[in-house]
Amino acid sequence: MAVTACQGLGFVVSLIGIAGIIAATCMDQWSTQDLYNNPVTAVFNYQGLWRSCVRESSGFTECRGYFTLLGLPAMLQAVRALMIVGIVLGAIGLLVSIFALKCIRIGSMEDSAKANMTLTSGIMFIVSGLCAIAGVSVFANMLVTNFWMSTANMYTGMGGMVQTVQTRYTFGAALFVGWVAGGLTLIGGVMMCIACRGLAPEETNYKAVSYHASGHSVAYKPGGFKASTGFGSNTKNKKIYDGGARTEDEVQSYPSKHDYV
């Protein structure tokens, strides 16, 4: 029961996390204009991984995509790659974990198979979460570096020296969404890995049962069956004697409310 709950909770937490990673990747507010130097600006700039936007005094927001691939900073490309890898791994992990859920019956899938799939999805979630956290952190580091490098005054203009305040950018909402989402995916993955340990059938330790044969006193101690972790192999420990103790697996093998969606 605890294993099922841990696995289910891990799945849900990872699902929320991956949804958050997707949302963060698509969001335009990875970096937003720092208003400290110019709190009265009527033109507000913010940028995402895929496009940059300007909200004007009329309330109109104009967004322009980065239509170049080669002209973009390598760091931005790296962040994009990390986020996409995170999404892809997370999506595959979700797909695998659906079939691994203990509360879902698919044919005669063995518990060892479900355990393996749970572990696989858990590892995928952990890597997915780490990719998202890394991507967001790289971008945040890039922002911090650029922020301190930006000079308060930059001289540009046509035919003369024109004073302008250079636009500086600070952390946007997407960074916080990404960090939280990555963390959730990571936590979900760890929970799946923990659930995997509970799902994997271990060596069954039967209580010793004494049978008194006439003239001899022999104690039979069954329990020399090692559980296989291979897909498709029969891992159920068979009863040795009709009156013997059932394995934990067999006690739970009757249909219960957890066996169906």
Epitope: S52, V54, Q163
Partner: antibody, heavy 115, light 113 residues
């Protein structure tokens, strides 16, 4: 066709208040801010402030804080400006304007403050 | 606040003539986010509301005749009317659309001889 239809002229006594309206049509009212501008007869233009009809967020020119109050009603696509404690200095034409780069202006509401 | 200074305050021209008016801002109106100058020009005819002519310092609003040309960047801007016509008699205002409070120039009054 985009239109900003303003309420008619107002003749008010000093110290009184006036509320003028600006009804928007031909575009999605909540997509653009509604700004208000003051123009004294034969003079230049002064920005009063704006209201975002989507969430009723407002921003005022410091000069008009306490003098003007901007509100809006999404259901009727109408923006309102309340002017309080009127003096002869407030006698002017008041315009509402909206859309990108303020492409559309109302016809103006003439407010005359006279005893 | 950004101060907008327009010159001259008044211009008297003959039809067909080329006319140039200037607008200077106390701070740059160039937005580095999209490399656009947030300066707008309006035309106000007597008894009417102002009409948008040019935005982003040089982009003509649709329907505005191509004789109206906006130029400049940063703090210095110019509105040029290549061949003035009788219907161009009006006051021309420039506006800072970059920083609050939004501010307008005092206007250039274009009169015909």
């Amino acid at each position: 066709e985009v239109q900003l239809q303003q309420s008619g002229p107002e003749l008010v006594k000093p110290g009184a208040s006036v509320k003028m309206s600006c009804k928007a049509s031909g575009y999605t009212f909540t997509n653009y801010f509604v700004h208000w501008v003051k123009q004294k007869p034969g003079q230049g233009l002064e920005w009063i402030g704006y209201i975002n009809p989507y969430n009723d967020d407002t921003k005022y020119n410091e000069k008009f804080k306490g003098k003007a109050t901007l509100t809006s009603d999404k259901s009727s696509s109408t923006a309102y400006m309340d002017l309080s404690s009127l003096t002869s200095e407030d006698s002017a034409v008041y315009y509402c304007l909206s859309l990108r780069f303020f492409a559309y202006w109302g016809q103006g509401t003439l407010v005359t403050v006279s005893a | 606040d950004i101060v907008m200074t327009q010159s001259p305050s008044s211009l008297t021209v003959t039809a067909g003539e080329k006319v140039t008016m200037s607008c200077k801002s106390s701070q740059s109106l160039l937005n580095s986010g999209n490399q656009k100058n947030y300066l707008t020009w309006y035309q106000q005819k007597p008894g009417q509301a102002p009409k948008l002519l040019i935005y982003w310092a040089s982009t003509r609003e649709s329907g505005v005749p191509d004789r109206f040309i906006g130029s400049g960047s940063g703090t210095d801007f110019t509105l040029t009317i290549s061949h003035v016509q009788a219907e161009d008699l009006a006051v021309y205002f420039c506006q800072n659309d970059y920083s609050y409070p939004l501010t307008f120039g005092a206007g250039t009054n274009l009169e015909l001889k």
